[in-house]
Each structure stands twice: as C-alpha cells, then as structure tokens.
C-alpha cells in the first residue's frame, strides 16, 4: 500500500521478513510425557524430541495456524516405569510431525500427537 | 544408563536427538503487537517478525530455558493508526534477540522484549 512512498529495496526486505514469518511447519522441541498426557509412573529418556509443528503468523487476527496434514515419525526412546522393576525398555514412540499448515478460522480440538506402539 | 543392553549406534542416535533438543536460541516468529502490549488503534505491517528466542529442554524438569544475554535487532515496519488519518509510517522497531540461554530454576517475570524508538 505504500509502494509510492518508499524505495523498492526497503519494501523487498519487509516482504521477505513477512514471508519468513508465515504459517508453516517449523522444527520444534516437544516434551514426550506432556504430549502423551500426564502419567505419574512412566517417564521417557530423552524426555524431549525434535519434530515439525505448525507455527507462524496469519494475515488476519481471527485465523490460527493449524496443521492440515500430518505424518508420524518413530522415535526410539527409553521407557522407564517407576518403581523400576526391570531394565529401561527401548520403545518406538510415534510422534506427530506436521507436514502441511494452513491459516484456519477456528482451532479444532487437538488430538494426542503421540501414538504408542 | 543402558549402554550394556543396546548397540552403540542406537544409543548414539538417541544421544544426538537429546543434544538437539537442549536449551538454546532458536529462530522464532513473534507478533509485534503482542510483544509491545495491546493497543486497540495501532497495528504493524508485517505483524510478525523473526528473531531468536530461547527454547528447548533442560536436564531437569524443574528448570526453565531462559535468556541470559540479549541483543536488540532493528526491524523496519509500517505503523498503521486507526482510523487511517495519514500515510502508514515506516518506523524502526527494536526487537529482543536472545543470544545466550541457560536453564534456570525459576522464571523471573518477563520484561517487555521490544523497545520503541
């Protein structure tokens, strides 16, 4: 809207910044136990994993950056049950990895992002 | 803890995953208006900017990943006042960019992260 008032280079820099902030899958650190839902006797090592999750800005305040497509990545983690009656078990934990994002009007209720095998 | 029970390659993959989730400055999208504090009649274009902010996991659940050093990056943004009585003004907005992070025991109350010039 202000193309006539500012030099093209400044506008280009601003536009590039805006593009980089747009709603898209971004690498995020998630805590496994929190994602699984609270359990007092089951812990994971490492407690956190890296996955892609939707994040960033939308053009309108009323829109929310949401996932439209999801793949599940299998992470090998040690599952520790308390009290520790056996050797910590190496288990595959499937973690939601957002592959597509879109600015949507309302936030549907979030399903659990982790599937245990 | 389970070095004797699992092959070294599996343990190496798990360890690398853990290292990548550790508390460190990560590129983040922040909404300028929210950071500045709510104002009903002033908007920014673009509304979001990319900066580095502390994020990730700590070695203890009771610790929080917090910034220990901060630089301020100047971002050129259009400031729009509503009702639109004049041309949107290009203003420099200084945004906090976390350059150092540490896992700290408690979260001090967060000061505003943006300085207006």
């Amino acid at each position: 809207f202000a193309a006539t008032f500012y030099d093209i280079e400044t506008l280009k820099v601003i536009d590039e910044e805006w593009q980089r902030t747009q709603c898209s899958p971004r690498e995020t650190c998630v805590e496994v136990a929190s994602e699984l839902g609270k359990s007092t006797n089951t812990f994971f090592k490492p407690p956190c994993v890296n996955v892609f999750r939707c994040g960033g800005c939308c053009n309108e305040e009323s829109l929310i950056c949401m996932n439209t497509s999801t793949s599940y990545i299998s992470k090998q983690l040690f599952e520790i049950s308390v009290p520790l009656t056996s050797v910590p078990e190496l288990v595959p934990v499937k973690v939601a990895n957002h592959t597509g994002c879109k600015c949507l009007p309302t936030a549907p209720r979030h399903p659990y992002s982790i599937i245990r095998r | 803890f389970a070095a004797t029970f699992y092959d070294i390659e599996t343990l190496k993959v798990i360890d690398e995953e853990w290292q990548r989730t550790q508390c460190s400055p990560r590129e983040t999208c922040v909404e300028v208006a929210s950071e500045l504090g709510k104002s009903t009649n002033t908007f920014f274009k673009p509304p979001c900017v990319n900066v580095f902010r502390c994020g990730g996991c700590c070695n203890e659940e009771s610790l929080i990943c917090m910034n220990t050093s901060t630089s301020y990056i100047s971002k050129q943004l259009f400031e729009i006042s509503v009702p639109l009585t004049s041309v949107p003004e290009l203003v420099p907005v200084k945004v906090a960019n976390h350059t150092g992070c540490k896992c700290l025991p408690t979260a001090p109350r967060h000061p505003y992260s943006i300085i207006r010039r």
Partner: antibody
Framework: QVQLAQSGAKVKQPGASVKASCKAS????????MYWVRQAPGQGLEWMGY????????TYNQKFKGRVTMTTDTSTSTAYMELRSLRSDDTAVYYC???????????WGRGTLVTVAS | DIVMTQTPLSSPVTLGQPASISCRSS???????????LHWLQQRPGQPPRLLIY???NRSSGVPDRFSGSGAGTDFTLKISRVEAEDVGVYYC?????????FGQGTKLEIK
C-alpha cells in the same frame, strides 16, 4: 550400570585450595546435571551447586559464591569441584551426585574427604 | 532459603513395626509447572546417601515397597510400613523446587 568414581582423601592447610574429581560412567554424561553436596563430620547435607555438563552452565549456592568453581571435561566424562580459601569448617566429605530429569539425586559418588588443618 | 524441618530428630523403633518421619518446608514446594520436587534420601552408617523417594511419592530404583511418601504443599511424610534391620540410618528430606536446593537436618532411625 551408573557409577560415579571420586578422587581420594585430601589434607589441606587453611587458605589453600582443593580440587575434587568425579568420573562418571554407564550413562550419557551431558544428559544429566551434576550436583555437589558436602557433609561435615557428624552433620547433615549441604548443597553447594551444580553444573550442566552439556554447556558448562553452573548454579552455585550463594554461600559458596566466589570460592567455588565447578567444571567438567566431557571427553573423559569427569566433573570437578574446586574450593578456594579453605577454612577449618570446610572439613567435610564432598559428594558428587547425578540428578535425574524428574528430580532427586539418583546416583551418588562415595565422597572425597577433605581435611583442613594446620 | 527454604528451611526444611524434620521431626522427630531421632526415632527408636521395634523391628517389624511401622515408622513415620515428617518434613515441613518454610514455603510451598509446588513448582510453577505444577510438580512438587520433594525427595527423601537414606544414609546408612558409613555410606553415601541414597535416593528413596522422588517427587513426593515415587519410589526410586530398587527401593522396597515398604517405603512410601505422601504430602503436599509444605507438609510431607515418609512412612516405613515394617522396619527391618537394614533400614537403620539417617533419613533426609530435600527439595529441588527452589535454589538453593536444601535438606532437612536428618532423622536418625534406630532399633529399640
């Protein structure tokens, strides 16, 4: 299995410094904070501080600030605790202890007895 | 600093009988994340301390089920359902919600 092997007993003069070591094995050294706790003869436990071996970040008990330095050598999975300007009331067993992610010092070394006497 | 006060300081018990140790903190131990970082340690004579219970009620690896922890906020209890000879030693409560981490002064458990 997890083991924390600490250096042997030391006798020091008042005003001197002592450096205790703690060699960790059986787990990923950088994935757990290492605490240092001391116990004077016949007394209770006193927390000195901890180090995050991943990045070397330290948090010290204010009581020891300026006198204590905690370091690690990740290549040998060893933690060190140096205490300077020793006084007779620093005579104690100095323990290193690994802290679990979910809280609590879950593995302890056998301790290093430091005697400060002239 | 958070002051941890244990009672009693000495507890003579009969083998096979229950024992209870109380620990009170000068401030709430509920962390901003909702967890309570109150732990119990056992120190047998001539040994380093050993973690018995963490986060109020979770038994550590290899700890017999006769040990149990309970409590909330500022008041916590360690219970031994049936005392055995190997339980003799000093018991400490400790907190890792606040810095500095602090310990109770210890409770000496001895056999009558």
């Amino acid at each position: 299995q997890v083991q924390l092997a600490q250096s042997g007993a030391k006798v020091k003069q008042p005003g001197a410094s002592v450096k205790a070591s703690c060699k960790a094995s059986g787990y990923t050294f950088t994935g757990y904070n290492m605490y240092w706790v001391r116990q004077a003869p016949g007394q209770g436990l006193e927390w000195m501080g901890y180090i995050d071996p991943y990045n070397g970040d330290t948090t010290y008990n204010q009581k020891f600030k300026g006198r204590v330095t905690m370091t690690t050598d990740t290549s040998t999975s060893t933690a060190y605790m140096e205490l300077r300007s020793l006084r007779s009331d620093d005579t104690a067993v100095y323990y290193c202890a690994r802290t679990s992610y979910y809280g609590g010092m879950d593995y302890w070394g056998r301790g290093t007895l430091v005697t400060v006497a002239s | 600093d958070i002051v941890m006060t244990q009672t009693p300081l000495s507890s003579p018990v009969t083998l096979g009988q229950p024992a209870s140790i109380s620990c009170r903190s000068s401030q709430s131990l509920v962390h901003s994340n909702g967890n309570t970082y109150l732990h119990w340690l056992q120190q047998r004579p001539g040994q380093p301390p050993r973690l018995l219970i963490y986060k109020v009620s979770n038994r550590s690896s290899g700890v017999p089920d006769r040990f149990s922890g309970s409590g909330a906020g500022t008041d916590f209890t360690l219970k031994i359902s049936r005392v055995e000879a190997e339980d003799v030693g000093v018991y400490y409560c400790s907190q890792s919600t606040h810095v500095p981490r602090t310990f109770g002064q210890g409770t000496k458990l001895e056999i009558k």
